[in-house]
């Protein structure tokens, strides 16, 4: 049969449209299916029928049912029926599956959470948005009329968003809130012959002797999640671990991604107690994916 | 009543056009969507068009996209359906229909039918 | 876009028996399936919508049942005005789509 699913949360407004919709003008007769008691119109009930639109005001656990909503047309009518679930409120943070509206996704350059059923509302701006039960905060999140804009979107962004808001019916408020998953997905990938971001090819840095110094190999491959990309640094054309010098460390390469999407690798060479021979050696950060290699050489001098 | 009333059917040849039009009466023409079907000899209802009511928007077939277009002048109570680059699977008995339930974006059944016009293709 | 299969092609019946028509969708149409009659000759007119709803004028001998992708169209007792051609339309989205049709003819 033509129904759809509903479901609010005790004490809280719940506004359920017929889902057999109609013109503004066709007359709609709302039951309560189980005993086919007819839904009053007055606004005075705490469940009543306006037009296409069955109000809680406020929902109760014991409103749970399916409500028939009849559209008459001058020719037709046609039914439709409205499965309303009223849940207790939950003692925790959690919120449970079944109160979850569909998930949405979102990447860097499409970030909006929209509010789930506030279009049947009479809200005022603004939202509040909450994910993981905590209030966001910060210039990155912006509620903008119905829906929540992330800013320069990432992964750890994913998780669970609550939209808050009041409804008001002939001057009374009744809060509402409804949650639902947000994901990150990469924007598809791809990956391109290597960009060594630092050092300038041919570079000279300049040290003083006895000090520390560290030198950063950064390199960008393309976006997404890259197969092969390694960077690495070379000594006089030589692995780090083939020289045996124990003042001068590699360290393990930095995954790093860029506002702009780009997936890059930053590796840190770490030179101790600067000495006159290290003057005299060719530092080379490679950069390699299945594209190839490319090379920027670097240099030290003394201050 | 209602009563709806097509005409402009005919032969062309491949390649040619024509302009159907359909005459309502009998309903207030401008709240409803309205629709073309045709039916090739021998064969079964197949949906080419609809316009919806006040001012809405256009579907049309995947075979006739880009070559039929669906239009309305409510002031005349008549529908148009305006065919170019006809072929020779284009022949059939044209009517149009009326949708009574009419919302944005959805569709319903047709209860109202004009008798048809016959558009023939062939060289 | 949905298929619509109609069953069978052809039903060879007497008057005063009963006919069942079936009309199977390639997906769920929830019940936005409507069903028409068509005689030689005319347009077709329309007998059940939303599945099982009779539209106004047609006799109660005509039923619809079935939601989903399952629909059947019964007529209780043959008249012999009903041996015409059958057809089914689903409407939950564009494009609407008709089955090929089931003719029903005296045997």
């Known amino acids: 049969k033509f129904s759809k699913q509903s479901w609010g949360l005790e004490n809280e407004a719940l506004i359920v449209r017929c889902p057999r919709q109609g013109k503004s003008s066709y007359i709609v007769d709302w039951y309560y299916s189980q005993t086919n008691k007819s839904i009053p119109t007055q606004e005075r009930n705490r469940v009543f029928a306006s037009g296409q639109l069955l109000k809680f005001l406020p929902a109760e656990v014991a409103d749970s049912g399916i409500y028939t909503c009849i559209v008459r047309s001058p020719t037709f009518n046609r039914t439709g029926y409205a499965n309303v679930t009223i849940y207790k409120k939950q003692p925790d943070c959690n919120v449970p599956d079944y109160l979850m509206y569909s998930t949405v996704s979102g990447s860097e350059k499409n970030s909006k959470i929209y509010c789930p059923t506030i279009d049947l509302y009479n809200w005022t701006a603004p939202l509040e948005w909450f994910k993981n039960c905590q209030a966001l905060q910060g210039s990155r999140y912006k509620a903008h009329k119905s829906f929540l804009v992330i800013d320069n979107v990432m992964t750890d962004d994913a998780g669970d968003y609550t939209c808050k808001f009041i409804h008001n019916e002939n001057g009374a408020n009744y809060s509402v809130t409804a949650t639902r998953s947000f994901t990150v997905k990469d924007e598809q990938g791809f990956s391109l012959f290597p960009v060594i971001r630092a050092p300038a090819h041919n570079e000279t840095k300049e040290v003083e002797i006895g000090e520390n110094t560290n030198l950063t190999c950064s390199a960008c491959f393309g976006k997404g999640a890259q197969f092969l990309a390694t960077v690495q640094w070379q000594l006089n054309g030589n692995k780090i671990t083939d020289f045996s010098e124990p003042r001068i460390q590699q360290e393990e390469g930095q995954n790093q991604s860029f506002s702009n999407g780009l997936a890059c690798v930053n590796t840190v060479l770490r030179i101790a107690d600067v000495k006159e021979e290290d003057l005299l050696l060719r530092y080379d950060c490679l950069a390699l994916n299945l594209h190839g290699l490319r090379r920027h050489t670097i240099r030290l001098s003394r201050k | 009543e209602v009563q709806l009333l097509e005409s402009g059917g005919g032969l062309v040849q491949p390649g040619g056009s024509l302009r159907l039009s359909c005459a309502a009466s009998?309903?207030?023409?401008?709240?409803?969507?309205m629709i073309w079907v045709r039916q090739a000899p021998g064969k079964g209802l197949e949906w080419v068009s609809t316009?919806?009511?006040?001012?809405?928007?256009?579907y049309y077939a995947d075979s006739v996209k880009g070559r039929f277009t669906i239009s309305r002048d409510n002031s005349k109570n008549t529908l148009y359906l305006q065919m170019n680059s006809l072929r020779a699977e284009d022949t059939a008995v044209y009517y149009c229909a009326r949708d009574p339930w009419s919302t944005e974006g959805s569709f319903f059944v047709l209860d109202y039918w004009g008798q048809g016009t016959l558009v023939t293709v062939s060289s | 876009e949905i298929v619509l299969t109609q069953s069978p092609a052809t039903l060879s019946l007497s008057p005063g028996e009963r006919a069942t028509l079936s009309c199977r969708a390639s997906?769920?149409?929830?019940?936005?399936l409507a069903w028409y009659q068509q005689k030689p000759g005319q347009a077709p007119r329309l007998l059940i919508y939303?599945?099982?709803n009779r539209a106004t004028g047609i006799p109660a001998r005509f039923s619809g049942s079935g939601s989903g992708t399952d629909f059947t169209l019964t007529i209780s007792s043959l008249e012999p005005e009903d041996f015409a051609v059958y057809y089914c339309q689903q409407y939950i989205g564009a494009p609407i789509t008709f089955g090929q049709g089931t003719k029903v003819e005296i045997k």
């Open positions: 009998g309903f207030t023409f401008s709240i409803y969507d």
């Open positions: 316009i919806k009511g006040e001012g809405g928007g256009t």
């Open positions: 997906q769920s149409v929830d019940d936005d």
């Open positions: 939303d599945a099982s």
